[in-house]
Amino acid sequence: EPTMYGEILSPNYPQAYPSEVEKSWDIEVPEGYGIHLYFTHLDIELSENCAYDSVQIISGDTEEGRLCGQRSSNNPHSPIVEEFQVPYNKLQVIFKSDFSNEERFTGFAAYYVATDINECTDFVDVPCSHFCNNFIGGYFCSCPPEYFLHDDMKNCGVNCSGDVFTALIGEIASPNYPKPYPENSRCEYQIRLEKGFQVVVTLRREDFDVEAADSAGNCLDSLVFVAGDRQFGPYCGHGFPGPLNIETKSNALDIIFQTDLTGQKKGWKLRYHGDPMPCPKEDTPNSVWEPAKAKYVFRDVVQITCLDGFEVVEGRVGATSFYSTCQSNGKWSNSKLKCQPVDCGIPESIENGKVEDPESTLFGSVIRYTCEEPYYYMENGGGGEYHCAGNGSWVNEVLGPELPKCVPVCGVPREPFEEKQRIIGGSDADIKNFPWQVFFDNPWAGGALINEYWVLTAAHVVEGNREPTMYVGSTSVQTSRLAKSKMLTPEHVFIHPGWKLLEVPEGRTNFDNDIALVRLKDPVKMGPTVSPICLPGTSSDYNLMDGDLGLISGWGRTEKRDRAVRLKAARLPVAPLRKCKEVKVEKPTADAEAYVFTPNMICAGGEKGMDSCKGDSGGAFAVQDPNDKTKFYAAGLVSWGPQCGTYGLYTRVKNYVDWIMKTMQENSTPRED
């Protein structure tokens, strides 16, 4: 705890001090005081440099004195034999004695008192910039008129800060300009303009005279301009050394004028004004600017429109133009937006066709769709070539953005049917000869695939089972083969409205309109063993003449078996209807006259015993297309017959083309469209 005074005595004083002692006293007086230390008695063993016994006085790191021997006062009126005056408030006194004393020494008696120090004069460094005032225990600084004392309570300066200039034009000068500026001051001026305007400072060389730089080039007095993170200056010297026109690119400018204690000059004067912030005329590729101007400034708005085939993508939305505003910071809004080539994206896939992975999906790229040939062809034309259009769609010259449609090729077997060894009036066949052949397992019968979703068959096949199970793609109807083939699931059966439904179908004598359509749940995938047969055209070219040849196929009854294991086929000629009428019905269920013969029936067969039989019903009587010899069309459907191995009757499909087309159209699905 600091004290104002105190006494220090050597050990055992006034008796002799002991040997081998080291003792120290830390003296502390209050802040703002010095210490006056004086000895009234000194009797310590004398030695050179007081090396044996001594009393040492230390101030900080400085040894103020080292005492030994005997002293007496020079002044009869004063008891002081030695004294020290330090301008600090702390002092250390250390007493040391060695291991032996030749005589008896009594040591010392000392006293200290706190004394006032004159901070204004006692130190090399003057504590105040202008006036220094001492008082007991301290000092204070004061300033001349028009100066004020800074927060450090030591330095005086003029009150030249705090001015904020908001007008778009103005003039600022150093204090007292053109008289000498005050020393030891820091003047800060702020220019704050509305956002969107930049501060432009103009000076004349002759309006600037500030104390010059020292030999190292450092300004002693300086003028600095700070605009955001940009700094102009420091400037000093006679005549303004910087640019006479300073474009700050900022609406906020701080002017800092710093002076030292010496060398006052006349100072400086400047003008400023606010310029609307300019925005650069940027080069935005693949676009045009509207309006086009040589210079754009704050608040200007331009519409940037992409050239055809380019778009601006923001998020997931594509647009052909955007607006950009010259902002207060001198930057364009929406500057990240760019006109990029339109991307049409990965082209949509199509059923039963493919599109090669394009190298590019950008504007101008070309892709080609192809159908899975030879089983599908492009129905809606257009050649399959699409280019990436400016609107971001893949476009075909004929179809526009509509996708090509791959539809099954009809009537073309993968392998032509060749009559081999004759088996029961027919030959072994392969499903590839008759890829349209459909097998019905209950009742055992046939049908003809006419497109992806539809099977044509005889009405009498499905009248008793409206949910038939059908198979395609297999030559053999052995269980193991059917398990590997494609099973077709019906969605709905459509029997011709002219077909008369009977309570006892076994006794039927009227097979007029023996035709039905089965709509499938799922589309059939075409291939070498599954492919549709064509329908007849409506022109007279498709009117059959006697002797025209047609092919029949099926797994019906043969001479050896009730049901064929593998597909059988035969080539039959068309015969006059009377030939069928003339054959005696094998197992008549009524009078021969009761059997109905109509123009909706085709009579065929009678040659080499080739005929269709029980189990072949619903299969196609396939005839070569008169207008395209590579194709077959379903001229007839196996319907009924008087006797196997003679002549058979077939539903004349040409008479039902309108009904077939209407039924399919009315019962198509969006998928199919």
Epitope: F439, D441, N442, W444, T475, S476, V477, Q478, T479, S480, R481, L482, A483, K484, M487, K560, R561, R563, V565, R566
Partner: antibody
Framework: QVQLVQSGAEVKKPGASVKVSCKVS????????MHWVRQAPGKGLEWMGT????????IYAQKFQGRVTMTEDTSTDTAYMELSSLRSEDTAVYYC????????????WGQGTLVTVSS | DIQMTQSPSTLSASVGDRVTITCRAS??????LAWYQQKPGKAPKLLIY???SLESGVPSRFSGSGSGTEFTLTISSLQPDDFATYYC?????????FGQGTKVEIK
């Protein structure tokens, strides 16, 4: 009427081979697919394999692969099944069976041939 | 090869009972499943094919159902002639396989 007539019972020693025949009458072998099935005494039915005329290949159950050979002589309408490296657990009745149509797996069964493997 | 698992292995029932036998395939076999009845010393007799189609001449008290991997054979009212062993058989893959059998015996 189609019939399958199998060869008579056989007694074989372990390690030996047995060849069972199955003659088709009333139809031609080319129109049929012949399968072979066996049944050990008091045990279940085991499908052994078949000749697939469509693919022209013989398919065997994995269990018998490498030990069984199925052949056909179309001139005599006879099918054969030969099993080699016989062991006691091969003692069983061996049936030839024709494949059915339109989902029916087996149509016609032979009368069966008992093969006994005993040392 | 596809594994066929029948349950139960043995079933004790009385005349007139409704009996259900289950067959599970190790992978989907669609509806390519048949059920056979076998009596001692006789060749198996086909009851059901394609999972639910009744073979001609088989009494209507026998019925089959299921598709994919789960199948059942049901005898609606057990008759004295029905005490036998029943097998399921898959014919989806060309490597056909049988179940291990279910013996239906008199309770």
């Amino acid at each position: 009427q189609v019939q399958l007539v199998q060869s008579g019972a056989e007694v074989k020693k372990p390690g030996a081979s047995v060849k069972v025949s199955c003659k088709v009458s009333g139809d031609t072998l080319t129109e049929l697919s012949m399968h072979w099935v066996r049944q050990a005494p008091g045990k279940g039915l085991e499908w052994m394999g078949t000749f697939d005329p469509e693919e022209g290949e013989t398919i065997y159950a994995q269990k018998f692969q490498g030990r069984v050979t199925m052949t056909e002589d179309t001139s005599t309408d006879t099918a054969y099944m030969e099993l080699s490296s016989l062991r006691s657990e091969d003692t069983a009745v061996y049936y030839c069976v024709t494949e059915g149509l339109a989902g029916v797996p087996f149509d016609l069964w032979g009368q069966g041939t008992l093969v006994t493997v005993s040392s | 090869d596809i594994q066929m698992t029948q349950s139960p292995s043995t079933l004790s029932a009385s005349v007139g009972d409704r009996v259900t036998i289950t067959c599970r395939a190790s992978q989907s076999i669609s509806s390519w499943l048949a059920w056979y009845q076998q009596k001692p010393g006789k060749a198996p007799k086909l009851l059901i094919y394609k999972a639910s189609s009744l073979e001609s001449g088989v009494p209507s008290r026998f019925s089959g159902s299921g598709s994919g991997t789960e199948f059942t054979l049901t005898i609606s009212s057990l008759q004295p002639d029905d005490f036998a062993t029943y097998y399921c058989q898959q014919h989806n893959s060309y490597r056909w396989t049988f179940g291990q059998g279910t013996k239906v015996e008199i309770k």
